[in-house]
Interface confidence: low
Amino acid sequence: MEDEKPKVNPKLYMCVCEGLSCGNEDHCEGQQCFSSLSINDGFHVYQKGCFQVYEQGKMTCKTPPSPGQAVECCQGDWCNRNITAQLPTKGKSFPGTQNFHLE
């Protein structure tokens, strides 16, 4: 039965959280972890965190990197700890499927 309490919820992972949206916390719990890089007014903005709703992560994680933004997603406790998103270099393309890591 879907509502029965699982002993361990297999879809929730502990993620490293870094960036403005994290407030004072350095971790969060969600269905996917991510590491992102975006260019904002010429500055590189790195963020890490979690998607608490799977659909939200699915949409974002499947987006191929653009010159202004890249997101790498993974599933596994602290899996985003050592992931640093990178913007595509000139002349290289990164298919969206390469942008999703399952641990």
Partner: antibody
Framework: QVQLQQWGAGLLKPSETLSLTCAVY????????WSWIRQPPGKGLEWLGE???????NNNPSLASRVTISVDTSKSQFSLRLTSVTAADTATYYC?????????WGQGTRVTVSS | IQMTQSPSSLSASVGDRVTITCQAS??????LNWYQQKPGQAPNLLIY???NLLPGVPSRFSGSGSGTDFSFTISSLQPEDIATYYC?????????FGGGTTVAIRR
């Protein structure tokens, strides 16, 4: 980040009903179980019960049928009702968000039951 | 499931190795967490699933054990570690905590 803010009456008389509410900010209701935990002065922690986003509850049998936990997903809130309180129910009450562990906690509400 | 924690209190010097034990009344399949609670604050999850530290938790904290017997260790006690520590299982309902261990600095 998930933040929990709780409120409710802090002073009750014996036989009255304790009512506390916890508001959830920046959190997905479907991602967590929502629990109430209490701690009598100078004592340990006691889990009272939990609810999920669908309203399914599990309560601690030690409190029999005195505990009711409810959820209002439209307001991102969940609540605790404890009926027929006695001095033994004097404690700090915490709301929490958990899956494998109680990861996020409210600030706590000190409830005193005294005639 | 009952969780028996010992000792209920201890006093140690800064730099000492401190160990707290937690015994479950039955096998809890390693579904065991450890919390730190400082005076006037809500508890804080330090370790989940026996030995996994949350990020930001100093590496001097560690957990071990399996089945019914578990331990929590502070390898080198620091003044900021003064708190009460609780174990908690989530193998079955109701979820229960150990009675707590209050750690103080010996002067």
């Amino acid at each position: 980040q998930v933040q929990l803010q709780q409120w409710g009456a802090g002073l009750l008389k014996p036989s009255e009903t304790l009512s506390l509410t916890c508001a959830v900010y920046n959190g997905s209701f479907s991602s967590f179980y929502w629990s109430w935990i209490r701690q009598p002065p100078g004592k340990g922690l006691e889990w009272l019960g939990e609810i999920n986003h669908r309203g399914r509850t599990n309560n601690n049998p030690s409190l029999a049928s005195r505990v009711t936990i409810s959820v209002d997903t439209s307001k991102s809130q969940f609540s605790l009702r404890l009926t027929s309180v006695t001095a033994a129910d004097t404690a700090t009450y915490y709301c929490t968000a958990h899956t494998r562990g109680f990861l996020y906690w409210g600030q706590g509400t000190r409830v005193t039951v005294s005639s | 499931i009952q969780m028996t924690q010992s000792p209920s209190s201890l006093s140690a010097s800064v730099g000492d190795r401190v160990t707290i034990t937690c015994q479950a009344s039955q096998d809890i399949n390693n579904y065991l967490n450890w919390y730190q609670q400082k005076p006037g604050q809500a508890p804080n999850l330090l370790i989940y699933d026996v030995f996994n530290l949350l990020p930001g938790v100093p590496s001097r904290f560690s957990g071990s054990g399996s089945g019914t017997d578990f331990s929590f260790t502070i390898s080198s006690l620091q003044p900021e570690d003064i708190a009460t520590y609780y174990c908690q299982h989530y193998d079955d309902l109701p979820l229960t905590f150990g009675g707590g261990t209050t750690v103080a600095i010996r002067r």
